[in-house]
């Protein structure tokens, strides 16, 4: 059994979440990857995904979310810019591998966004600053409609749960992946 762990990020409004999801490059380099939010009592919702097949180092921007998949390094970089208090929640990276169920990558991210400045001049990053750093050739990828044969009857765990894992990825059994929802637009 594997502990499904969380890593917390405490940020202020206007700042940027910047995380990297590590995957086995031989197995998943070209696989489509997604960034999901897990709300209590609901199935995970896909907020953004890479193209299919996933393109190397090619930024995909969906609203305030930017995904970059680096095949040579086996890393998916996820950025959420101009954070808002409403963005607080539990997030995860997953890899699509149809017809099998998606794999989740360690760790889940517990994002806590609070109002106000961090207390240091220049530390409050606004949307313009962050989007400016993204190449203008970003594309919006349409995420696949994937419905698990199983259903979720209760909220996913808030901290840890025991699940089996092949290699370094957790096999999700209760998950629905939906078409991109513009919650961050």
């Amino acid at each position: 059994a594997t502990k499904l762990t969380e890593e917390k990020y405490e940020l202020k409004e206007g700042q940027t979440l910047d995380v990297k999801c590590d995957y086995t490059l031989e197995k998943f380099a070209s696989s489509q990857k997604a960034w999901q939010i897990i709300r209590d009592g609901e199935m995970p919702k896909t907020l953004a995904c890479t193209e299919r097949p996933s393109k190397n180092s090619h930024p995909v921007q969906v609203g305030r979310i930017i995904l970059e998949d680096y095949h040579d390094h086996g890393l998916l970089r996820v950025r959420m810019v101009n954070l808002q208090v409403e963005d607080s929640g539990l997030y995860q990276c997953v890899i699509y591998q149809p017809p099998k169920e998606p794999h989740m990558l360690f760790d889940r991210i517990r994002l806590v966004v609070t109002k106000g400045f961090s207390g240091t001049p220049g530390s409050n990053e606004n949307s313009t600053q962050n989007v400016y750093k993204i190449p203008p050739t970003t594309t919006k990828a349409l995420c696949p409609l994937y419905t698990s044969p199983r259903t979720v009857t209760q909220a996913p765990p808030k901290s840890t749960a025991d699940v089996s894992t092949p290699d370094s990825e957790i096999n999700l059994t209760n998950v629905t992946d939906i078409i991109r929802v513009p919650v961050f637009n």
């Epitope: 890593e7 360690f106 894992t165």
Partner: antibody
Framework: EVQVLESGGGLVQPGGSLRLSCAAS????????MSWVRQAPGKGLEWVST????????YYADSVKGRFTISRDNSKNTLDLQMNSLRAADTAVYYC????????????WGQGTLVTVSS | EIVMTQSPATLSVSPGERATLSCRAS??????LAWYQQKPGQAPRLLIY???TRATGIPDRFSGSGSGTEFTLTISSLQSEDFAVYYC??????????FGQGTKVEIK
């Protein structure tokens, strides 16, 4: 509780070889990248090498590239650093460190093992 | 390679006082910065990551701020156990992941 414990340090002559090992417990070893970070006597910290959770990706500092090899055995929860062609400048305490799950910082460290390269 | 510069090299502070440590990156690293504490003869310990977030078990007298190239670690009221060397580290993307040279916080 996460624990990492290094072993294998010692005195070696310039040009010689040494193999460091790190035993890990308290976490899902194959899910996390692992690193070696060193600290020369009285100096600061220097990142040496990192290996991904599956072992498919490795990174090295320029100062050790071609001489050091990082590897891991996920069935035994162990991390190794094979050090060849050692130089006096490699003298340091070598720390085994677990890489965080979301970024390349080091959330758990071993107590370190001293490597002395001297004739 | 990103160069991390810490200042001052040594900071003399009395117990109970506030300590402010600085770390500067040679190029923007957004909030990809960590702070570590190291006491003599011990391994480093993670204090702050993502520039602002305290690691598990770290007292709230430690706080991190800054973004881009300028970062600060603040210890609001120094305790005897806080006298140590502090290192910053960037992790923006690819290696080498570099550390600052360290700031020694000593008793005044």
């Amino acid at each position: 509780e996460v624990q990492v414990l290094e072993s294998g340090g010692g005195l070696v002559q310039p040009g010689g070889s040494l193999r460091l090992s790190c035993a890990a417990s308290g976490f899902t070893f194959n899910a996390y990248a692992m690193s070696w970070v060193r600290q020369a006597p009285g100096k600061g910290l220097e990142w040496v090498s990192t290996i991904s959770g599956s072992g498919s990706t490795t990174y090295y500092a320029d100062s050790v590239k071609g001489r050091f090899t990082i590897s891991r055995d996920n069935s035994k929860n162990t991390l190794d650093l094979q050090m060849n062609s050692l130089r006096a400048a490699d003298t340091a305490v070598y720390y085994c460190a677990k890489v965080a799950g979301s970024n390349f910082f080091f959330d758990h460290w071993g107590q370190g093992t001293l490597v002395t390269v001297s004739s | 390679e990103i160069v991390m510069t810490q200042s001052p090299a040594t900071l003399s502070v009395s117990p109970g006082e506030r300590a402010t440590l600085s770390c500067r990156a040679s190029q923007s690293i957004n909030s990809n910065l960590a702070w570590y504490q190291q006491k003599p003869g011990q391994a480093p310990r993670l204090l702050i990551y993502g520039a602002y977030t305290r690691a598990t078990g770290i007292p709230d007298r430690f706080s991190g701020s800054g973004s881009g190239t300028e970062f600060t670690l603040t210890i609001s009221s120094l305790q005897s156990e806080d006298f140590a060397v502090y290192y910053c580290q960037e992790f923006i993307m690819w290696p080498p992941w570099t550390f600052g040279q360290g700031t020694k916080v000593e008793i005044k």
